[in-house]
C-alpha cells in the first residue's frame, strides 16, 4: 500500500514543498514520485520511505508516489494548489469632470490571480462597496454603473481584489488599484451675465461685471473676459453656487471704434460665453477760455467755450447761437463777478446714448479792500466793565489785512470779546491792506464810567454814565 | 533802506544825566510808534517805554519819572533822555520800530543798541 | 497789570529734537504776542507775530500757537542755529507794565 504526505497542500507560486512517499511494505522494489516539478530527493535511513523537495510550483499540480511491492503496485496522488494575487488591477480611465445627472460606468479589470474560486471583485466609492463579484474570465471584468451626484465631488472611486485563503489555514489578500477621483460640476444651460458700459471714453476706465448663477463646485469655474484682443485680469468674488467677476478695462485712443467684450466661463469639459459689443469714443471736455483768469473791477472780460466738432455746446445754461460746437460771451468785471463759475456743457452722441461733458472755470477779480460804515462803524460807546466784541470787516479780493491801532501801536482786538476798560478808550486808524492797495477809516471808542455823587446828608449812589471821548491825531499807522 | 541806529551810549556817572538818540532811515517817524528796550549784561530784555505817533508816551511802571522818550520828526530822530542814572541802568539800549505787518518789510526793526555804563 | 511768564527758563535739546517753549499771560492778551531769538552780543530777531504768523525769512521749523494767555513757540527739529535765547513779548497793552517780555528761554546743547 502507497501513501503521501501532505494529501493537500496550498503554497505560494513558486515555492517549494517536502512531499514524503511511504509504502507498506518493507522491502519495496520501487518507491518514487512522479512530477514535472523539479525533485531532490533527502537520504533517509530505511527502505519504506522517501522525501522530496519539490520546487519552483507555478500552478496547480498532482505529483504521484509509487511503490512496487511483492504484493503488488500501487499509487497515492498530493494535491498541490498554487496561489497569487493578481498582475494587474484596473479602473478603466474616465474623464475627470462628470456633469452631475450624468450615469458614469466604472469598469475594474484584473488580470491573474488563483486560485480563482477564492478570489472575488469588489467596487468601491471611498469604503462603500458598490459591487461585489467573483473573478471570472482573463482578464476578469466587473462593471456598474453610478447616477453622478453633487455629493460625489471629490469622491474616490477604487477596485479592490480579494483572495481570501483563511479556509485554508492562510489570510486574506486584497490589492487596490489606484483611485478615480471624481470631479463633479454643474454648469447651466444659460449664458453668463455681462454688466458692462455699452460705451466707454478713450483714456478711461470702466468696470465691467460677469455673473452666473447655479455653478458646482463655483471654486473651479475659470472665467476668461477680454475685450477685443486685450485678456482682463478680474477680481472674482464667489458664493455659495455663484460668482461675480470683476474687472476694469482701461482704453486707449488705438481701441476707439466697436470692440467685442466676451465672458466666457469654463467648469469641467463645457463652457458658456456672453458676446456683447462696446463702443469706444474720443471726447475731450470743452475748453473753457478766459481772457484772463484774474482780472481788476472794470476790466472787458471775454468768455469762449470749444469742444469736439460733433458736439452741441451751452454757456452757463445759455445754448450756442447757432447750435453748435463754440459759444462765447462778454462782460465787463465787477466784484460780484469774483468767484463767478462759466460753465460750459457740451453734448455727444455716441451709439444712441447721449455724452455730456463739463468744463468750468472760476473768474476771480481783484477789487478793494474796502471799509465801509455799515461795515466798520465809525463810533462806539460802551459802558465801563462791560463784555463787548469791536466788530470791523474790510471787503476786497485778496482779502485786506485788517489792524485797528491807537496812537499807532496799540491793537483793538476786532472780532475778540474784551473787557471794556478805560485804556480801551481813543480814537483808532483802523487799516485794511492787501496787493490792491489800501484804505484806512477812523474809528472811536467812547467809553461811559459812573460818576459818583453824593446826595445831601445822604450815602445814596446816583450811578450817572458820563461819556468820555478822547480824539487822536492817527496817521496812517498799522501795529500788532 | 530802513535803518535804526542808536548812539550816546558810554561811560556815565551816577546822578548825572545821558541822552540817548535813534536816528532812522527809510520811513518816516510820523507813521510808526518808537519803542527802547533794555538789556542788562547776562539779563533778559526789559521794555523800558514807546511813542505813538501822536507823540503820546508810554512806560513802564519802573521807568515813569526818570525815563523820558521824545521825538524830532523833522530830524527823524527818537530820544531816550535817563535822568539820575544808577548803577543798575548798565545795559544795551535798543531802539525798536514798533508796528509790523506782512505788508511791512518783513521784520520788526531793531537798532544794534549802544552800551551805557553807570558807574563812579 | 499784565506780567508775561515764560517756561522753562533753560532747555537742553539734541539736533533733530521737537522743543516747545511756552509763555503765560497774566491776563488775555488775545492773539498780540510775538517771539524773538537772540544770540549773545546780537540784536533780538524777529520770528513770530500775532502769536503765529511767522515773519518773513523765518524758517517753516518754527511755529507760534495759541490765544488769550497760554502760547506756545515749537520748534519741530532743532537745528544747530537754533540755539539761542528766546523771548516772548505782549503787544496788546501799555496800562502800567513791568515788563512787555517773558523772562528768555535759553535752548542749550544736551
Known amino acids: 500500500q502507497t501513501s503521501v504526505s501532505p494529501s493537500k497542500v496550498i503554497l505560494p507560486r513558486g515555492g517549494s514543498v517536502l512531499v514524503t512517499c511511504s509504502t507498506s511494505c518493507d522491502q519495496p522494489k520501487l518507491l518514487g514520485i512522479e512530477t514535472p516539478l523539479p525533485k531532490k530527493e533527502l537520504l533517509l535511513p530505511g527502505n519504506n520511505r522517501k522525501v522530496y523537495e519539490l520546487s519552483n510550483v507555478q500552478e496547480d499540480s498532482q505529483p504521484m508516489c509509487y511503490s512496487n511491492c511483492p504484493d503488488g503496485q500501487s499509487t497515492a496522488k498530493t494535491f498541490l494548489t498554487v496561489y497569487w494575487t493578481p498582475e494587474r488591477v484596473e479602473l478603466a480611465p474616465l474623464p475627470s469632470w462628470q456633469p452631475v445627472g450624468k450615469n458614469l460606468t466604472l469598469r475594474c479589470q484584473v488580470e491573474g490571480g488563483a486560485p480563482r474560486a477564492n478570489l472575488t471583485v469588489v467596487l468601491l466609492r471611498g469604503e462603500k462597496e458598490l459591487k461585489r463579484e467573483p473573478a471570472v474570465g482573463e482578464p476578469a471584468e466587473v462593471t456598474t454603473t453610478v447616477l453622478v451626484r453633487r455629493d460625489h465631488h471629490g469622491a474616490n472611486f477604487s477596485c479592490r481584489t480579494e483572495l481570501d485563503l483563511r479556509p485554508q489555514g492562510l489570510e486574506l489578500f486584497e490589492n487596490t488599484s489606484a483611485p478615480y477621483q471624481l470631479q463633479t460640476f454643474v454648469l447651466p444651460a444659460t449664458p453668463p451675465q455681462l454688466v458692462s458700459p455699452r460705451v466707454l471714453e478713450v483714456d478711461t476706465q470702466g468696470t465691467v461685471v460677469c455673473s452666473l448663477d447655479g455653478l458646482f463646485p463655483v471654486s473651479e469655474a475659470q472665467v476668461h473676459l477680454a475685450l477685443g484682443d486685450q485678456r482682463l485680469n478680474p477680481t472674482v468674488t464667489y458664493g455659495n453656487d455663484s460668482f461675480s467677476a470683476k474687472a476694469s478695462v482701461s482704453v486707449t485712443a488705438e481701441d476707439e471704434g466697436t470692440q467685442r467684450l466676451t465672458c466666457a466661463v469654463i467648469l469641467g469639459n463645457q463652457s458658456q460665453e456672453t458676446l456683447q459689443t462696446v463702443t469706444i469714443y474720443s471726447f475731450p471736455a470743452p475748453n473753457v477760455i478766459l481772457t484772463k483768469p484774474e482780472v481788476s473791477e472794470g476790466t472787458e472780460v471775454t468768455v469762449k467755450c470749444e469742444a469736439h466738432p460733433r458736439a452741441k455746446v451751452t454757456l452757463n445754461g445759455v445754448p450756442a447761437q447757432p447750435l453748435g460746437p463754440r459759444a462765447q460771451l462778454l462782460l465787463k468785471a465787477t466784484p460780484e463777478d469774483n468767484g463767478r463759475s462759466f460753465s460750459c456743457s457740451a453734448t455727444l452722441e455716441v451709439a444712441g446714448q447721449l455724452i455730456h461733458k463739463n468744463q468750468t472755470r472760476e473768474l476771480r477779480v481783484l477789487y478793494g479792500p474796502r471799509l465801509d460804515e455799515r461795515d466798520c462803524p465809525g463810533n462806539w460807546t460802551w459802558p465801563e466793565n462791560s463784555q463787548q466784541t469791536p466788530m470791523c470787516q474790510a471787503w476786497g479780493n485778496p482779502l485786506p489785512e485788517l489792524k485797528c491801532l491807537k496812537d499807532g501801536t496799540f491793537p483793538l482786538p476786532i472780532g475778540e470779546s474784551v473787557t471794556v476798560t478805560r485804556d480801551l478808550e481813543g480814537t483808532y486808524l483802523c487799516r485794511a491792506r492787501s496787493t490792491q492797495g489800501e484804505v484806512t477809516r477812523k474809528v472811536t471808542v467812547n467809553v461811559l464810567s459812573p460818576r459818583y455823587e453824593g446826595g445831601s446828608g445822604g450815602s445814596g449812589l446816583n450811578d450817572i454814565f458820563e461819556a468820555q471821548k478822547i480824539e487822536w491825531h492817527e496817521e496812517n499807522l498799522y501795529f500788532q | 533802506e530802513v535803518q535804526v541806529l542808536e548812539s550816546g551810549g558810554g561811560l556815565v556817572q551816577p546822578g548825572g544825566s545821558l541822552r540817548l538818540s535813534c536816528a532812522v532811515s527809510?520811513?518816516?517817524?510820523?507813521?510808526?510808534?518808537m519803542g527802547w528796550v533794555r538789556q542788562a549784561p547776562g539779563k533778559g530784555l526789559e521794555w523800558i517805554g514807546i511813542?505813538?505817533?501822536?507823540?503820546?508816551?508810554y512806560y513802564a511802571s519802573w521807568a515813569k519819572g526818570r525815563f523820558t522818550i521824545s521825538k524830532d520828526n523833522s530830524k527823524n530822530t527818537v530820544y531816550l533822555q535817563i535822568n539820575s542814572p544808577r548803577a543798575e541802568d548798565t545795559a544795551v539800549y535798543y531802539c525798536?520800530?514798533?508796528?509790523?505787518?506782512?505788508?511791512?518789510?518783513?521784520?520788526?526793526?531793531w537798532g544794534q543798541g549802544t552800551l551805557v555804563t553807570v558807574s563812579s | 497789570d499784565i506780567q508775561m511768564t515764560q517756561s522753562p527758563s533753560t532747555l537742553s535739546a539734541s539736533v533733530g529734537d521737537r522743543v516747545t517753549i511756552t509763555c503765560q499771560a497774566s491776563?488775555?492778551?488775545?492773539?498780540?504776542l510775538s517771539w524773538y531769538q537772540q544770540k549773545p552780543g546780537k540784536a533780538p530777531k524777529f520770528l513770530i507775530y500775532?502769536?503765529?504768523k511767522l515773519a518773513s525769512g523765518v524758517p517753516s521749523r518754527f511755529s507760534g500757537s495759541g490765544s488769550g494767555t497760554e502760547f506756545t513757540l515749537t520748534i519741530s527739529s532743532v537745528q544747530p542755529d537754533d540755539f539761542a535765547t528766546y523771548y516772548c513779548?505782549?503787544?496788546?497793552?501799555?496800562?502800567?507794565?513791568?515788563?512787555?517780555f517773558g523772562g528768555g528761554t535759553k535752548v542749550e546743547i544736551k
Open positions: 525798536v520800530r514798533d508796528p509790523y505787518d506782512s505788508y511791512d518789510d518783513g521784520y520788526r526793526l
Open positions: 527809510g520811513f518816516s517817524l510820523s507813521s510808526h510808534a
Open positions: 511813542i505813538g505817533s501822536s507823540d503820546r508816551t
Open positions: 491776563q488775555s492778551i488775545y492773539r498780540y
Open positions: 500775532d502769536a503765529s
Open positions: 513779548q505782549q503787544a496788546y497793552s501799555s496800562g502800567s507794565i513791568d515788563n512787555a
